[in-house]
C-alpha cells in the first residue's frame, strides 16, 4: 500500500521522500525565507481501507510575510491554550486542548494568517461529554455576571459575578456548572 505524490506547495519545499511512498511515511513542508507556513507542516501517508494509501490532511500553504499582520486572542470555550502567546504575528500558531470532561472537534492548531484571521481551519470547539447543561443564571441587582457563552452552560464552565462600584458581593464570586447539570452555589447578592 502506498501514497501518490504529496500535494505540491507554492513558494516552499517538500522534504525528501522515496517512491513508492509507504504507509507511515511522513513528509514535511517548509516555506522560502519571505513566506510563512499556514497549516500543519507534516503530512502522514495512511490507509483507510487497507487497499489504497492517502495523505491524512491537506497540504499547508506558504503566504508572503506580512509584517503588519496580527491576530486577536483566540477563545475556545471549554478549552485552553497549550502553545502560543501574544502578540500573534503572521505565521504564529496556537494549539488548544480541552478541559476535563470536554472533547475536541476540529483541528487543535490554528495559524495567524496574512488577513489577520486564524486559519486555515476554524477554531476548534470543546464539547461537553455530558449531555446535561446548567440553566442560564440570573443577573443580580446592582451587579452583573460574565460567562464564556450565553444561555445554558456546559459542565466544567463557570460564571463570575461582580458588583457595581459601591456595592459589596455577598456569597460566591465564581459559580461552577457541575456534571450533574446543577450549579455549585446560588447566585450571590450585591449589598451596599
Amino acid at each position: 500500500i502506498s501514497c501518490g505524490s504529496p500535494p505540491p506547495i507554492l513558494n516552499g519545499r517538500i522534504s525528501y521522500y522515496s517512491t513508492p511512498i509507504a504507509v507511515g511515511t511522513v513528509i514535511r513542508y517548509s516555506c522560502s525565507g519571505t513566506f510563512r507556513l499556514i497549516g500543519e507542516k507534516s503530512l502522514l501517508c495512511i490507509t483507510k481501507d487497507k487497499v489504497d494509501g492517502t495523505w491524512d490532511k491537506p497540504a499547508p500553504k506558504c503566504e508572503y510575510f506580512n509584517k503588519y499582520s496580527s491576530c486577536p486572542e483566540p477563545i475556545v470555550p471549554g478549552g485552553y491554550k497549550i502553545r502560543g502567546s501574544t502578540p500573534y504575528r503572521h505565521g504564529d500558531s496556537v494549539t488548544f486542548a480541552c478541559k476535563t470532561n470536554f472533547s475536541m472537534n476540529g483541528n487543535k492548531s490554528v495559524w495567524c494568517q496574512a488577513n489577520n484571521m486564524w486559519g486555515p481551519t476554524r477554531l476548534p470547539t470543546c464539547v461537553s461529554v455530558f449531555p446535561l447543561e446548567c440553566p442560564a443564571l440570573p443577573m443580580i441587582h446592582n451587579g452583573h455576571h460574565t460567562s464564556e457563552n450565553v444561555g445554558s452552560i456546559a459542565p466544567g464552565l463557570s460564571v463570575t459575578y461582580s458588583c457595581e462600584s459601591g456595592y459589596l458581593l455577598v456569597g460566591e464570586k465564581i459559580i461552577n456548572c457541575l456534571s450533574s447539570g446543577k450549579w455549585s452555589a446560588v447566585p450571590p447578592t450585591c449589598e451596599e
Epitope: 522534504s15 504507509v23 507511515g24 511522513v26 514535511r28 502522514l44
Partner: antibody
Framework: QVQLVQSGAEVKKPGSSVKVSCKAS????????ISWVRQAPGQGLEWMGR????????NYAQKFQGRVTITADKSTSTAYMELSSLRSEDTAVYYC????????????WGQGTLVTVSS | EIVMTQSPATLSVSPGERATLSCRAG??????LAWYQQKPGQAPRLLIY???SRATGIPARFSGSGSGTEFTLTISSLQSEDFAVYYC????????FGQGTKLEIK
C-alpha cells in the same frame, strides 16, 4: 510531560529473541508516535523503527527490516519491540522515545533496557 | 539513510567558556534537525528542535543555528552540568543520528 517506563534488563542467548516493553503514562497515547533507538556500549544512537499506535502502522530502518517487530497495545498504552535472531552485536541499551504527533524529534525517552546477548 | 557527521569527536573547554559543536548532513535537511544531551547512564534529553527552537525548560545558554547541511549547537557559558555527550538527529527523511561529540572539561 509523558513518562515512559521500560521493562527490565534481559540476558539472551545468540539466535533467540527478546521483547522489550514501554508503558506510557500522561498525555494521550493515540496522539503520538513511539520510536525505538538503541545504543551499543560506548557507541552512538541508532534508530530502529517506530509505530503510530492509533493507526497501528510500524516502519523500520533498513538495517533491522525482517528482524524487528514493533507493536502497540492501545488499551494499556504500551509499545513493544521484539528483536529476533540475536547476535552478540545486538548487546545494547534499547530506548523507547516519544514524538508528539509526528514532529520528528523526541520529547520524552524511556529509562532504557539493557539487553545482553551472550552464550 | 541520511548520514549525519558530527565534529569534533571530543571537545575540551573550560567552564565559563563558549562551546561550539558542529553537525553536517549528507544531503539538505532544511531545518529538520534536533540536538540532544546525554549524560552517563541516562537517556538522551531534547535540547533543540527545528534547528534553532529551544525545548521546554532548556536554559537560554543553549542555542542552535543552521539550515541545509551545516548546523551548529552553541553553549554560551559552560556550566559544570553541561559536560556530556551531544547528538544531532535529522528528521527530513525518516530518522538518523550523528555519532556524537563528547564535551569534556579542559
Amino acid at each position: 510531560q509523558v513518562q515512559l517506563v521500560q521493562s527490565g534488563a534481559e540476558v539472551k542467548k545468540p539466535g533467540s529473541s527478546v521483547k522489550v516493553s514501554c508503558k506510557a503514562s500522561g498525555g494521550t497515547f493515540s496522539s503520538y508516535a513511539i520510536s525505538w533507538v538503541r545504543q551499543a556500549p560506548g557507541q552512538g544512537l541508532e534508530w530502529m523503527g517506530r509505530i503510530i499506535p492509533i493507526l497501528g502502522i510500524a516502519n523500520y530502518a533498513q538495517k533491522f527490516q525482517g528482524r524487528v517487530t514493533i507493536t502497540a497495545d492501545k488499551s494499556t498504552s504500551t509499545a513493544y519491540m521484539e528483536l529476533s535472531s540475536l547476535r552478540s552485536e545486538d548487546t545494547a541499551v534499547y530506548y523507547c522515545a516519544r514524538e508528539e504527533d509526528i514532529s520528528g524529534y523526541y520529547q520524552d525517552w524511556g529509562q532504557g533496557t539493557l539487553v545482553t546477548v551472550s552464550s | 539513510e541520511i548520514v549525519m557527521t558530527q565534529s569534533p569527536a571530543t571537545l575540551s573547554v573550560s567552564p565559563g567558556e563558549r562551546a561550539t559543536l558542529s553537525c553536517r548532513a549528507g544531503q539538505s535537511i532544511s531545518r529538520y534537525l534536533a540536538w540532544y544531551q546525554q549524560k552517563p547512564g541516562q537517556a538522551p534529553r531534547l535540547l533543540i528542535y527545528d534547528a534553532s527552537s529551544r525545548a521546554t525548560g532548556i536554559p537560554a545558554r543553549f542555542s542552535g543555528s543552521g539550515s541545509g547541511t551545516e548546523f551548529t549547537l552553541t553553549i554560551s557559558s559552560l556550566q559544570s552540568e553541561d559536560f556530556a555527550v551531544y547528538y544531532c538527529q535529522q528528521y527530513e527523511y525518516w530518522y538518523s543520528f550523528g555519532q556524537g561529540t563528547k564535551l569534556e572539561i579542559k
